[in-house]
């Protein structure tokens, strides 16, 4: 049982700590090729590559406040959202918004979270309550994950919503008695 996702006041979905997003299931070995779907051409396409490292995907940065109950982070956090389709790195700038023109058949590559980081967030609460903290688990980088369409299947499951959800956590409040901790916090230890 993991830290559950909850919808906070800012309507962001923030999973709690134990619910680390899992990468999508590996579908590479489930490859089926439909000749009709390929238009009678061989399955290979000049732009396809077997090396996932040659593919690239976009990392979109966005900033949001973290909320928990009636509390809100003193500062916004910046995190990544992994954006949609992957393309060969050399073609990606031209491929944005162009869909699947560069590979009409064969493997599909999706942009999903790769690494995460935890960030301490100081929460400001109403009514003079003790400052509180949580740790937010944020996407630190994205990667291309190779998937394969099933036979006659043109649409792939979108893993974005489950894979890209940041992980929530809280950070300690600064304490007058702990100058070292305060300094680390002010310098954003993460």
């Amino acid at each position: 049982q993991g830290w559950q996702a909850f919808k906070n006041d800012a309507t962001e979905i923030i999973p709690e700590l134990g619910e680390y997003p899992e990468p999508p299931p590996e579908l590479e070995n489930n490859k089926t090729m439909n000749r009709a779907e390929n238009g009678g051409r061989p399955p290979h396409h000049p732009f396809e590559t077997k090396d996932v490292s040659e593919y690239s995907c976009r990392e979109l940065h966005f900033t949001r406040y973290v909320t928990d109950g009636p509390c809100r982070s003193a500062k916004p956090v910046t995190e990544l959202v992994c954006s949609g389709q992957c393309g060969p790195a050399r073609l990606l700038p031209n491929a944005i918004g162009r869909g699947k023109w560069w590979r009409p058949s064969g493997p599909d590559f999706r942009c999903i979270p790769d690494r995460y980081r935890a960030q301490r967030v100081q929460l400001l609460c109403p009514g003079g309550e003790a400052p509180r903290a949580r740790k937010v688990r944020l996407v630190a980088s994205c990667k291309c994950k190779r998937l394969t369409r099933f036979h006659n299947q043109s649409e792939l499951k979108d893993f974005g919503t489950e894979a890209a959800r940041p992980q929530k956590g809280r950070k300690p409040r600064p304490r007058a008695r702990s100058a070292k901790a305060n300094q680390a916090e002010l310098e954003n230890a993460y």
Epitope: W3, E16, L17, G18, Y20, D68, G69, P70, A118, R120, C125, P126, G127, E129, A130, R132, A133, R134, K135, V136, R137, Q167, K168, G169, R170, K171, P172, R173, R175, S178, K180, A181, A184, E185, A189, Y190
Partner: antibody, heavy 118, light 107 residues
């Protein structure tokens, strides 16, 4: 699967110290806050404090200030709570708990019984 | 320190009953209250936080309400596995403190 496994029962003499360990698995300990809560026999729960393994920040209940030390080894994902100058009223089950906040206790260890007796 | 006073200290109920446990804070704690369930010989389990938010996997028959100084944990239809001791906890001000517990027993 989040799991916290604590060290075994301890019997101590008054004035001695005890160090209880709590091995965390299922996520990195540095991404959490570690809490310690105790429960005297037949009594309620008493919060002792929390620590942040990432930077070593701590918050102790004033009642335990000066007697308790909470530390972690992030390389082994293990938290420790040391209580010194033990007295008979420190006889209790000591629980470690973890969570992503400084204020609620999401997952708990199974508890470690510490008996202080001369 | 903020005192959390639970009532009743114990109650007897039958499976299917609606059970209400109250917790009164000695000062305003806004909604900074959590509820835990503890069975004999076991560690507590988080049920509710922020007075009314259910924790992961907690059945919908458990609900929390209240703000300020008065809080309630309600079990809408008591199940056999719900016989346990329930604790409230405030996290409005240090030190975090718990209520004395309410033991729910089989009638």
């Amino acid at each position: 699967q989040v799991q916290l496994v604590q060290s075994g029962a301890e019997v101590k003499k008054p004035g001695a110290s005890v160090k209880v360990s709590c091995k965390v698995s299922g996520f990195p300990i540095k991404d959490t806050f570690q809490h310690w809560v105790r429960q005297a026999p037949g009594k309620g729960l008493e919060w002792m404090g929390w620590s942040d393994p990432e930077i070593g920040d701590t918050e102790y209940a004033s009642k335990f200030q000066g007697r308790v030390t909470m530390t972690e080894d992030t390389s082994t994902d293990t938290a420790y709570m040391e209580l010194s100058s033990l007295r008979s009223e420190d006889t209790a089950v000591y629980y470690c708990a973890t969570g992503d906040t400084t204020y609620k206790f999401d997952f708990w260890g199974q508890g470690t019984t510490v008996t202080v007796s001369s | 320190d903020i005192q959390m006073t639970q009532s009743p200290s114990s109650l007897s109920a039958s499976v299917g009953d609606r059970v209400t446990i109250t917790c009164k804070a000695s000062q305003d704690v806004h909604t900074a209250v959590a509820w835990y369930q503890q069975k004999p010989g076991k560690a507590p389990k988080l049920l509710i936080y922020w007075a009314s938010t259910r924790w992961t996997g907690v059945p919908s028959r458990f609900s929390g309400s209240g703000s300020g100084t008065d809080f309630t944990l309600t079990i809408s239809s008591l199940q056999p596995e719900d016989f346990a001791t329930y604790y409230c906890q405030q996290y409005s001000d240090y030190p975090w403190t718990f209520g004395g517990g309410t033991k729910v027993e089989i009638k």
